[in-house]
C-alpha cells in the first residue's frame, strides 16, 4: 500500500510567491508620468513576473509633518483618484494580483509616524483600515514601526482590525531594525503580521554567516510564517554586492516564507546609479529612452525591454525562479533543512512529502568551489541522493535539466546551484 | 475651542483620599489619550498617569511614585477623565492638570492639591 | 525610567539675541520630544512636538533640533514675551518625564 499522503497546510495568498513593493508610482512608470491609471498599463508586465502580490503607495494625502493635513482616505491628487484605485484593483483582481496599500502616515516627512499627537495618528490608522477594506484593499503596510511608540501594540490593533474583515487579509509591517531581539519582539504579540526588515543586510556576506543568519532567524520566530528580504523599501543593490545579486535571487525565492522585492530588484536597478535621481525612489528601466535627459546614458542590458530578450538576464532568472517558487510544493511549503557543505557555501534542502524535492547550493566565495556536500545531519526523511538534475544556475554554461553527480559538484564563484531530485519511498 | 477644567482639588489629610474630575469639551474626546500631570517648587512638572482609548482597552500607565495609589478612569459619555488618589502622602501636594494628548497639546489651569495634617 | 537632564536651570539673556536650551535624554527617544513654555500662573504651553514640529500658533523664531539622546530649543530672537520657564518632555516610553527646566530671563 503506497504511504498515506501528508496533510497539506492552510495556505493563503501570500504563501504562494512573491511579492513586489511600488513604493514610489512616479519613479516606477518612468520619467515625468505616473499615477493609478498608468499603473494599470503594467499589470501585464507584473503578472509576468508571477508576483501574487503588489505593495503600493503610500498614495494618501500628506502635508509633511502635520497631522491635521494627513488624510489617509484621501488619494493624493497627484496620483489618480479613488476612481482609478477602484479600477486599478479591479484590474489586479482579474490577474489574480492583490494589493497591498501602505499606509505610513508621515510619508513625506522626516518621522514617518510624526512622532507626535499618537492618538490621532492611531485613530486616523484605524479608520483608514476600515475604509480602505471595505474599498476592497488584500491588505496593508506599514513601515518604520521601530520609530512608532508602543508598536507591538498597535500592530495588534490593527492586525486584529485586518484579520477581523477576512483572514485572507494580510498586514505587513517594515522596520530599519536588524537586530533579532527587536523583530522577535515584534513578532511575537502579532501571529500573522509579516515583518520586513534589515536583518539580512546585517551581514558580512559569506556562506557561513548566511547561514548562521537564516538558521537564528527561523529557530527565533518559530514555526510562524516569515518573509525574506533585505531591508523594509530599499532595494537589492543598495545592499549587496553586484556579484551576489544573483545569489540572492535564488536564496530569497526558495527559503521557506514569502520573499519580499522592491520595483527594479528583478533587473538589477541601482539606486542613483545614473545622475539626478533621486536614492530612495530611482527611475524604473523599461527601455533605453527611459532616462531621455542624457542620450546613451542606459544601456540595452540595464533595462527591461533588453532583458526580457536575453534568456540569460537576471529578469529571465528572477522569472524562472518565480515561477518554479509559484508552482512547486517543496518550494511552496516544504520543510527546510541546512546541512553541512563546503566553506563558503550555504546548502539546504526543500522538501514536502512525496513531491519532488529541490536542493539548493550557493557559493558566496570568490572562487570555484567543490560543494563537499555533507548530509549526514540532514533528518532521514530528507537524505541526498547521489544525482540531482540541474533546475538552474545563477551563472551560464551550465545545461538545465542536466544531471549532476553531488559528490562531485564543483560551483563557480558567486554561483547558485537549484536542483531537484524525486522523492523515494 | 478645546476647553479642559479641572476639579475635586483641596486640603485632605496623610492618608485620605480624593476624586479628581476634568470635564474636556471642544474635542473628540473618545479619540483622545488622557494625562494627569502634577507640579510642585520641590518635584516641577512630573507625569502622573495617562488612559488610552476605548480601542485599546482603555490602557493605564502610572508614574512609579502613584502606582497602586491613584487610579486614572474615563466616561467617554460625559467627556470626563478622573483620577481616583488614595493613602495620599505630603509628597503628592501640587497643582494637578490634565492635559489631552500624546503629548500634551492642550492644559486645564490645574486644581491644587494639598495633603497636610 | 529615561531621565531627562536640561544642563542650564537659569539663562540670563540679552533682548534680540539668540537662545539654546538643550535637553539630553538617558536613553534613546527616537524624537518623542516636546517644549514646553510656563509663565508663572499658567499651565504649561506646548511649543514644539516630534522634536522639530512647530505648534499652530508658535511664533517662527522658535525652533527644535536633535535626534536619538540630544535635543535643543532654540529661539532666533529673544523677545520680552518669552520670558518663561522651558520644559523638555519624552513621550516615547513610560513613565513620561520632563526635565527640571530651565528659567529664562532678560539680561
Known amino acids: 500500500r503506497a504511504p498515506r499522503c501528508r496533510e497539506l497546510p492552510a495556505q493563503k495568498w501570500w504563501h504562494t510567491g512573491a511579492l513586489y513593493r511600488i513604493g514610489d508610482l512616479q519613479a516606477f512608470q518612468g520619467h515625468g508620468s505616473g499615477n493609478l491609471a498608468g499603473l494599470k498599463g503594467r499589470l501585464d508586465y507584473l503578472s509576468s513576473l508571477k508576483v501574487k502580490g503588489l505593495v503600493l503607495g503610500p498614495l494618501h494625502k500628506n502635508q509633511k509633518d502635520d497631522v491635521a493635513q494627513t488624510d489617509l482616505l484621501q488619494i493624493d491628487p497627484n496620483f489618480g483618484s479613488k476612481e482609478d484605485f477602484d479600477n486599478l484593483l479591479q484590474s489586479a483582481k482579474k490577474k489574480s494580483i492583490r494589493v497591498i496599500l501602505d499606509l505610513t502616515p508621515n510619508y513625506r516627512g522626516e518621522n514617518l509616524w510624526f512622532s507626535t499627537q499618537v492618538d490621532s495618528v492611531a485613530t486616523k490608522v484605524k479608520d483608514a483600515l476600515e475604509f480602505w477594506l471595505q474599498a476592497g484593499v488584500d491588505g496593508f503596510q506599514v513601515r518604520d514601526i521601530e520609530n512608532l511608540k508602543d508598536a507591538s501594540s498597535f500592530l495588534a490593533e490593527w492586525e486584529n482590525i485586518t484579520k477581523g474583515f477576512s483572514e485572507d487579509r494580510l498586514l505587513i509591517a517594515g522596520t530599519n531594525s536588524s537586530d533579532l531581539q527587536q523583530i522577535v519582539s515584534l513578532l511575537e504579540s502579532n501571529k500573522d503580521l509579516l515583518l520586513t526588515s534589515s536583518y539580512l543586510s546585517d551581514s558580512s556576506f559569506t556562506g557561513e554567516h548566511t547561514k548562521s543568519l537564516v538558521t537564528q532567524y527561523l529557530n527565533a520566530t518559530g514555526n510562524r510564517w516569515c518573509s525574506w528580504s533585505l531591508s523594509q523599501a530599499g532595494l537589492l543593490t543598495s545592499f549587496l554586492p553586484a556579484q551576489l545579486l544573483r545569489l540572492y535571487q535564488l536564496m530569497l525565492f526558495t527559503l521557506p516564507g514569502t520573499p519580499v522585492f522592491s520595483y527594479g530588484d528583478e533587473i538589477g536597478l541601482k539606486a542613483a546609479a545614473l545622475p539626478g535621481q533621486p536614492v530612495e525612489a530611482p527611475v524604473m528601466l523599461w527601455d533605453e529612452s527611459s532616462f531621455p535627459d542624457i542620450p546613451g546614458a542606459v544601456s540595452a542590458n540595464m533595462t527591461v525591454k533588453g532583458q526580457s530578450e536575453d534568456p540569460g538576464s537576471l529578469l529571465s532568472l528572477f522569472r524562472q525562479l518565480s515561477d518554479q517558487r509559484s508552482k512547486e510544493r517543496s518550494l511552496l511549503h516544504g520543510d527546510f533543512h541546512t546541512f553541512s557543505s563546503g566553506p563558503g557555501l550555504f546548502s539546504y534542502i526543500r522538501h514536502w512529502d512525496q513531491n519532488e524535492r529541490f536542493l539548493v547550493v550557493l557559493n558566496f566565495g570568490d572562487v570555484g568551489l567543490s560543494a563537499g556536500l555533507q548530509a549526514s545531519d540532514l533528518p532521514a526523511s530528507a537524505s541526498l541522493p547521489t544525482k540531482a538534475d540541474l533546475v538552474l544556475s545563477t551563472q551560464p554554461g551550465r545545461e538545465e535539466g542536466s544531471p549532476l553527480e553531488l559528490e562531485r559538484l564543483k560551483l563557480e564563484p558567486h554561483e547558485g546551484l537549484l536542483l531537484r531530485f524525486p522523492y523515494v519511498a | 475651542e478645546v476647553k479642559l477644567e479641572e476639579s475635586g482639588g483641596g486640603l485632605v489629610q496623610p492618608g485620605g483620599s480624593m476624586i479628581l474630575s476634568c470635564v474636556a469639551s471642544?474635542?473628540?474626546?473618545?479619540?483622545?489619550?488622557m494625562n494627569w500631570v502634577r507640579q510642585s517648587p520641590e518635584k516641577g512638572l512630573e507625569w502622573v498617569a495617562e488612559?488610552?482609548?476605548?480601542?485599546?482597552?482603555?490602557?493605564?500607565h502610572y508614574a512609579e511614585s502613584v502606582k497602586g495609589r491613584f487610579t486614572i478612569s474615563r466616561d467617554d459619555s460625559k467627556s470626563t477623565v478622573y483620577l481616583q488618589m488614595n493613602n495620599l502622602r505630603a509628597e503628592d501636594t501640587g497643582i494637578y492638570y490634565c492635559?489631552?494628548?500624546?503629548?500634551?497639546?492642550?492644559w486645564g489651569q490645574g486644581t491644587l492639591v494639598t495633603v497636610s495634617a | 525610567d529615561i531621565q531627562m537632564t536640561q544642563s542650564s536651570s537659569y539663562l540670563s539673556v540679552s533682548l534680540g539675541n539668540r537662545v539654546t536650551i538643550t535637553c539630553k535624554a538617558s536613553?534613546?527617544?527616537?524624537?518623542?520630544l516636546a517644549w514646553f513654555q510656563q509663565k508663572p500662573g499658567n499651565a504649561p504651553r506646548l511649543l514644539i512636538s516630534?522634536?522639530?514640529i512647530l505648534e499652530t500658533g508658535v511664533p517662527s523664531r522658535f525652533s527644535g533640533s536633535g535626534s536619538g539622546k540630544d535635543y535643543t530649543l532654540s529661539i532666533t530672537s529673544l523677545q520680552t514675551e518669552d520670558v518663561a520657564t522651558y520644559y523638555c518632555?519624552?513621550?516615547?516610553?513610560?513613565?513620561?518625564?520632563f526635565g527640571g527646566g530651565t528659567k529664562l530671563e532678560i539680561k
Open positions: 492635559s489631552r494628548g500624546d503629548p500634551g497639546a492642550y
Open positions: 471642544g474635542f473628540t474626546f473618545s479619540n483622545s489619550w
Open positions: 488612559i488610552r482609548l476605548r480601542s485599546n482597552n482603555y490602557a493605564t
Open positions: 536613553d534613546h527617544i527616537k524624537n518623542w
Open positions: 516630534g522634536a522639530t
Open positions: 518632555q519624552q513621550y516615547w516610553s513610560t513613565p513620561y518625564t
